[in-house]
């Protein structure tokens, strides 16, 4: 985890202001509307599992 203004999140993760933590970009497949997904420079998410 990081505090705002410090070093960026590790590769594959992005800062969530809502959760005050670095979050996995991979989870944007399941939860694409999460605030941190905007910071995830990944391929468009595949259709989710449901």
């Amino acid at each position: 985890e990081q505090a705002p203004g410090t070093a960026p999140c590790s590769r594959g993760s992005s800062w969530s202001a809502d959760l005050d933590a670095c979050m996995d970009c991979a989870s944007c497949r399941a939860r694409p509307h999460s605030d941190f997904c905007l910071g995830c420079a990944a391929a468009p998410p595949a259709p989710f599992r449901l």
Epitope: G12, D18, C25, A26, S27, A42, A43, R49, L50
Partner: antibody, heavy 119, light 111 residues
């Protein structure tokens, strides 16, 4: 420090009911999806049920083996969630864990509670 | 449902050597970017503990002796060098779809 504190469990007769509870602390409970996972020597680790967050309309999902028998619910105001189990059978015997996930993996786990279904 | 097959069911590895555990999914659990496979360690009387998420991402606080690899249907957990404290049962789990399913577990003994 993240904690998931479980209560409930014990011995119940076949056909009986039991309610398990899990109280969370140390993380943003309302944003997380919550699950129950059970473990038995016969079936190993088995995901049982999931309840999603308010932003996901509190959607619930169940393993086929418990559909119509188990009901998962949550109370965000008190950071707790529940598993109501009805019409219990011997095959429901096991250790039941509550767990939190943001989306994919089970990050935090409760200590586990034993359920025995036997006459 | 996606069936997760773990091999071997048990193994004994000498202290300081490498332990390799395999997990095969009955269908692909990967996109072009991420694999939806996770690994856990469980010691007797304790709940499972997350080790590796998304096939190869080490969970915070987990020693770098643990590593994960693989994509599609075939995945591997490596522990090197193994330590006494690694005696446990290890499980894989997919999150590709509901129901989430786990492998049958691999019991690791340190010689």
């Amino acid at each position: 420090q993240v904690q998931l504190q479980q209560s409930g469990g014990g011995l119940v007769q076949p056909g009986g009911s039991m309610k398990l509870s899990c109280i969370a602390s140390g993380f943003t409970f309302s944003s997380y999806w919550m699950s129950w996972v059970r473990q038995s020597p016969e079936k190993g680790l088995e995901w049982v049920a999931e309840i999603r967050s308010k932003s996901d309309n509190y959607a619930t999902h169940y393993a086929e083996s418990v559909k119509g028998k188990f009901t998962i619910s949550r109370d965000d105001s008190k950071s707790r969630f529940f598993l109501q189990m009805n019409n219990l059978r011997a095959e429901d015997t096991g250790i039941y864990y509550c767990s939190s996930t943001y989306a994919d993996y089970f990050h935090y786990w409760g200590q586990g509670t034993d359920l025995t279904v036997s006459s | 449902d996606i069936v997760m097959t773990q091999t071997p069911a048990s193994l004994a590895v000498s202290l300081g050597q490498r332990a390799t555990i395999s997990c095969r999914a009955s269908q692909s659990v990967s996109t072009s970017t991420y694999s939806y496979m996770h690994w856990y360690q469980q010691k007797p009387g304790q709940p499972p503990k997350l080790l590796i998420k998304y096939a190869s991402s080490l969970e915070s606080g987990v020693p770098a002796r643990f590593s994960g690899s693989g994509s599609g249907t075939d995945f591997t957990l490596n522990i090197h060098p193994v330590e006494e404290d690694d005696t446990a049962t290890y499980y894989c789990q997919h999150s590709w779809e509901i129901p989430y399913t786990f492998g049958g577990g691999t019991k690791l003994e340190i010689k």
